[in-house]
């Protein structure tokens, strides 16, 4: 029961986390800056992984996508890649974990197969969460670097004078969404890995066969063992003493004087 709960909770937590990673990737508020506040209107600029937007206090918002001619930094491309890899891995992990859920029966799927699928999805969630956390952290580092490098200056360009205003970008809501979502996916993955241990079969009984000796003496064959997976608490090898040429699972209807029961 505890295993099913752990697996189910891990799945739900990961699902929320991956939904958050997708939301963060699509959000425009990765970085924000208040441009100025004049008597006419307050203007805000916020930038995401895919486009930049300007919003006025009147509610008017205009967004423009990034184009290659703007020469996007390699770091931004790296963040995009990390987030997409995180989403893809997370989505595959979710798909695998649905079939791995103990509460869902698909044909005659073995518990060992479910355990393996749970472990696979768990690892995928962990990597997905790490990708998201890494992506958001790289972007945050870009903002911090940009914050300290921003300066106001003036120069003459083509067509007239050009002035740069000292405006600084700060952390947007998407960064916090990304960090939390990445953390949840990571936690969900760990829970799935823990659930995998409990899902693995406790004991697998192998039919051990021992034979009679030619005389009236009892033959002891040390071959009869119960093999354990190592996941369960019972890891002791149990010797089976059997004088007859019978398998361990057979019922002894008429015990002979040579049998040790």
């Amino acid at each position: 029961m505890a295993v099913t709960a752990c697996q189910g909770l891990g799945f739900v937590v990961s699902l929320i986390g991956i939904a958050g990673i997708i939301a963060a990737t699509c959000m425009d508020q990765w970085s924000t800056q208040d441009l100025y506040n004049n008597p006419v209107t307050a203007v805000f600029n916020y930038q995401g992984l895919w486009r930049s937007c300007v919003r006025e206090s009147s509610g008017f918002t205009e967004c423009r996508g990034y184009f290659t001619l703007l020469g996007l930094p390699a770091m931004l491309q790296a963040v995009r890649a990390l987030m997409i890899v995180g989403i893809v891995l997370g989505a595959i992990g979710l798909l695998v974990s649905i079939f791995a859920l103990k509460c869902i029966r698909i044909g005659s799927m073995e518990d060992s197969a479910k355990a393996n699928m749970t472990l696979t999805s768990g690892i995928m969630f962990i990597v997905s969460g790490l990708c998201a956390i890494a992506g958001v952290s790289v972007f945050a580092n870009m903002l911090v670097t940009n914050f300290w490098m921003s300066t106001a200056n003036m120069y003459t360009g083509m067509g007239g004078m050009v002035q740069t205003v000292q405006t600084r970008y700060t952390f947007g809501a998407a960064l916090f969404v990304g960090w939390v979502a990445g953390g949840l996916t990571l936690i969900g993955g760990v829970m799935m890995c823990i659930a995998c241990r409990g899902l693995a079969p406790e004991e697998t009984n192998y039919k051990a066969v021992s034979y009679h000796a030619s005389g009236h003496s009892v033959a002891y064959k040390p071959g009869g063992f119960k093999a354990s997976t190592g996941f369960g608490s019972n890891t002791k090898n149990k010797k089976i003493y059997d004088g007859g040429a019978r398998t361990e699972d057979e019922v002894q209807s008429y015990p002979s004087k040579h049998d040790y029961v």
Partner: nanobody, 121 residues
């Protein structure tokens, strides 16, 4: 590179009208505001009118009711309709645009070369 091309200036009689236009060209992310400033000989450059992309406008007290600023967001162009012109309106009119040039780049103020408006008495 971003370029502002202003045009429409000239010589006009007092009480007459003119229309100035300014187009932004080049690669950039967002235009925040566009507007017009003027500089009369021996004077400081002063605000005439500005507009945001959303249509919020701001006028200098001296031109209120006479000048109208309009924009065409699709063409990234701003217009200044000047009516009831006075001799004191004589100046070089400069187009101005506040632009975010690229990703995580600072707000940049671009200026046009200026167009001369002369109002004769």
């Amino acid at each position: 590179a971003v370029q502002l091309v202003d045009s429409g200036g000239g010589l006009v009689q007092a009480g007459g009208s003119l229309r100035l236009s300014c187009a932004v060209s080049g690669s950039f992310l967002n235009i925040v505001t566009m507007g017009w400033y003027r500089q009369a000989p021996g004077k400081q450059r002063e605000l005439v009118a500005t507009t945001t992309r959303g249509g919020s406008t701001n006028y200098a007290d001296s031109v209120k009711g006479r000048f109208t600023i309009a924009r065409d967001n699709a063409k990234n162009t701003v217009y200044l309709h000047m009516d009831a012109l006075k001799p004191e309106d004589t100046a070089v009119y400069y187009c101005n645009a506040e632009i975010i040039p690229g990703f995580l780049q600072q707000l940049t103020l671009y200026w046009g070369q200026g167009t001369q408006v002369t109002v004769s008495a």
